[in-house]
């Protein structure tokens, strides 16, 4: 049954689908923004380097209490090979400046529609 | 919110030299494509120069190249343009921007103004 099991469970999400998937999680965030995302919290901003994405789940993991952007932080963490939690500081962010969650939401997009652009799923 | 704070501008004669500087603040600006526009007294704005989110892709106006250099650094949030060979008809109030083409993504700065004059 163990052997079994395997062959019912997917397989890995292969790396496009994945990213695909995030864009249009951060599209719905961005279009379906109502009042100020997170209540205007702010977030430090990131480098845009080989650890992006963890970067980016450092940044947006000490938002709490905001709904809107848990599914973001979730599968952000598919991408991200370590583990990530609040209050990390990692040198991928670029230190005294923050941002609005919102501005960082939409600019982390724009970043991501030009890797799957490029062909970078990774 | 996001902002673009040009300097460097000023007075200088034809043939001198000018650096212009854009401090970018409140948004990832090294996901940006960047670049400068200039309006001249009574004239419609024109594009100058822009430059690639990494900085290794540049474009030139004809009426520029050859003279301006576009440059950013990125751990600076920083834009710039060198300018030589000024001519007077350089003259005009010279805005940092951005350069995207996805809509919701245009931003500018308010602007510094470069005067060519002997």
């Known amino acids: 049954l163990t052997c079994l099991g395997g062959f019912a469970s997917p397989g890995p999400v292969p790396p496009s689908t994945a990213l695909r998937e995030l864009i249009e999680e951060l599209v719905n965030i961005t279009q379906n923004q109502k009042a100020p995302l997170c209540n205007g919290s702010m977030v430090w901003s990131i480098n845009l380097t080989a650890g992006m994405y963890c970067a980016a789940l450092e940044s947006l993991i000490n938002v709490s209490g905001c709904s809107a952007i848990e599914k973001t932080q979730r599968m952000l963490s598919g991408f991200c090979p370590h583990k990530v939690s609040a209050g990390q500081f990692s040198s991928l962010h670029v230190r005294d400046t923050k941002i609005e969650v919102a501005q960082f939401v939409k600019d982390l997009l724009l970043h991501l529609k030009k890797l799957f652009r490029e062909g970078q799923f990774n | 919110g996001v902002q673009l704070l040009e300097s460097g501008g000023g007075l200088v004669q034809p043939g001198g030299s000018l650096r212009l500087s854009c401090a970018a603040s409140g948004f990832i600006f090294a996901v940006y494509d960047m670049g400068w526009a200039r309006q001249a007294p009574g004239k419609g704005l024109e594009w100058v120069s822009s430059i690639n989110d990494g900085g290794n892709v540049t474009y030139y106006a004809d009426s520029v190249k050859g003279r301006f250099t576009i440059s950013r650094d990125n751990s600076k949030n920083t834009l710039y343009l060198q300018m030589n060979s000024l001519r007077a008809e350089d003259t005009a109030v010279y805005y940092c921007?951005?350069?995207?083409?996805?809509?919701?993504?245009?931003?500018r700065g308010q602007g510094t103004l470069v005067t060519v004059s002997s």
């Open positions: 921007a951005t350069a995207e083409d996805e809509p919701g993504y245009d931003y």
